[in-house]
């Protein structure tokens, strides 16, 4: 089977600072030199792009300057971090991997990671 399989954790809990990290791992059917990783958010049947980065194998993963995502790559594994999350951002985050070069192109889609975000309680006023 020449399909590309993508694995990601089923559930992740964001930190109190609204940061969630997870690993996206793909089994490559070919020797790719250029890989594109996209994080998608699926709510009901709507799919929206959260962030995307293209990297050359062996090089660092670079997201756009205004991206809420950062990441590092190591072989066929990408460590993704999404920042600035709030409770309303709780949902299913899908890791999509595309082997862009050389041909043939391959698409890999993970089953999604359910990220739970809990807004921190506001600090009570303290008397000094």
């Amino acid at each position: 089977c020449k399909a590309m399989h993508v694995a990601q954790p089923a559930v992740v809990l964001a930190s109190s600072r609204g940061i969630a990290s997870f690993v996206c791992e793909y089994a490559s059917p070919g020797k790719a030199t250029e890989v594109r990783v996209t994080v998608l958010r699926q709510a009901d049947s709507q799919v929206t792009e959260v962030c995307a980065a293209t990297y050359m194998m062996g090089n660092e993963l670079t997201f756009l300057d205004d991206s809420i995502c950062t990441g590092t790559s190591s072989g066929n594994q990408v460590n993704l971090t999404i920042q600035g999350l709030r409770a309303m951002d709780t949902g299913l985050y899908i890791c999509k991997v595309e082997l862009m070069y050389p041909p043939p192109y391959y698409l890999g889609i993970g089953n999604g990671t359910q990220i739970y975000v809990i807004d921190p309680e506001p600090c009570p006023d303290s008397d000094f």
Epitope: C1, K2, A3, M4, H5, P29, E34, R36, T38, L40, V47, T48, E49, A52, T54, I94, K96, E98, M100, Y101, P103, P104, Y105, Y106, L107, I109
Partner: antibody, heavy 118, light 108 residues
Framework: QVQLVESGGGVVQPGRSLRLSCAAS????????VNWVRQAPGKGLEWVAV????????YYADSVKGRFTISRDNSKNTLFLQMNSLRAEDTAVYYC???????????WGQGTLVTVSS | EIVLTQSPGTLSLSPGERATLSCRAS???????LAWYQQKPGQAPRLLIY???SRATGIPDRFSGSGSGTDFTLTISRLEPEDFAVYYC?????????FGPGTKVDIK
């Protein structure tokens, strides 16, 4: 809403060239891959080519490789197909189709007819 | 290249009946990357099902998809007059992307 409108079809002699365009609106064009798919009269669908995101990655069907060139202008939200050395078997309706974030072709234009005949 | 074959070539049924269309791949296709399209005469194709079983936006629930590996099925539970059309399967997991030859569902 997503809209794709093809243009540039017509009657052309074998060996000649033609350039098709597809104007896109209703979505952020640069964030999506776009395809050309063709359909010969009375026949099924045949994938022709795809171009990804910034235009640096392109893939073609063997039947058109070396003769057709797919390109895009993200500043004008437009997709192109340059068709050279046309043959009678290239006669078809040519559709542009957007790639959904999860991979299938979710939005299609109405098509433009290319007839290659002497 | 993954070759897709569809059967039957033509399916003659009456409105209200159940339609079962088959798509077979020459090699294993992950179910995540198998789609079904509907095409009516003079119109562009329309995405019905992706990921083998997920309905596209606005597609009625009488359409359902199933299958894995090399065998996939599109089922129309009760045919409506507007469902008589040609149906194509497609794999989009690797290039070249390929379509099946189509199944025509016509009125008996």
């Amino acid at each position: 809403q997503v809209q794709l409108v093809e243009s540039g079809g017509g009657v052309v002699q074998p060996g000649r060239s033609l350039r098709l365009s597809c104007a896109a609106s209703g979505f952020t064009f640069s964030r999506f891959g776009v395809n050309w798919v063709r359909q010969a009269p009375g026949k099924g669908l045949e994938w022709v080519a795809v171009i990804w995101y910034d235009g640096s990655n392109k893939y073609y069907a063997d039947s058109v490789k070396g003769r057709f060139t797919i390109s895009r202008d993200n500043s004008k939200n437009t997709l192109f197909l340059q068709m050279n050395s046309l043959r009678a078997e290239d006669t078809a309706v040519y559709y542009c189709a957007r790639v959904h974030q999860l991979g299938p072709f979710d939005s299609w234009g109405q098509g433009t007819l290319v007839t290659v005949s002497s | 290249e993954i070759v897709l074959t569809q059967s039957p070539g033509t399916l003659s049924l009456s409105p209200g009946e159940r339609a079962t269309l088959s798509c077979r791949a020459s090699q294993s296709v992950s179910s995540s990357y198998l789609a079904w399209y509907q095409q009516k005469p003079g119109q562009a194709p329309r995405l019905l099902i992706y990921g083998a079983s997920s309905r596209a936006t606005g597609i009625p629930d009488r359409f359902s998809g199933s299958g894995s590996g090399t065998d996939f099925t599109l089922t129309i539970s009760r045919l409506e007059p507007e469902d008589f059309a040609v149906y194509y399967c497609q794999q989009y997991g690797s290039s070249p992307f390929t379509f099946g030859p189509g199944t025509k569902v016509d009125i008996k």
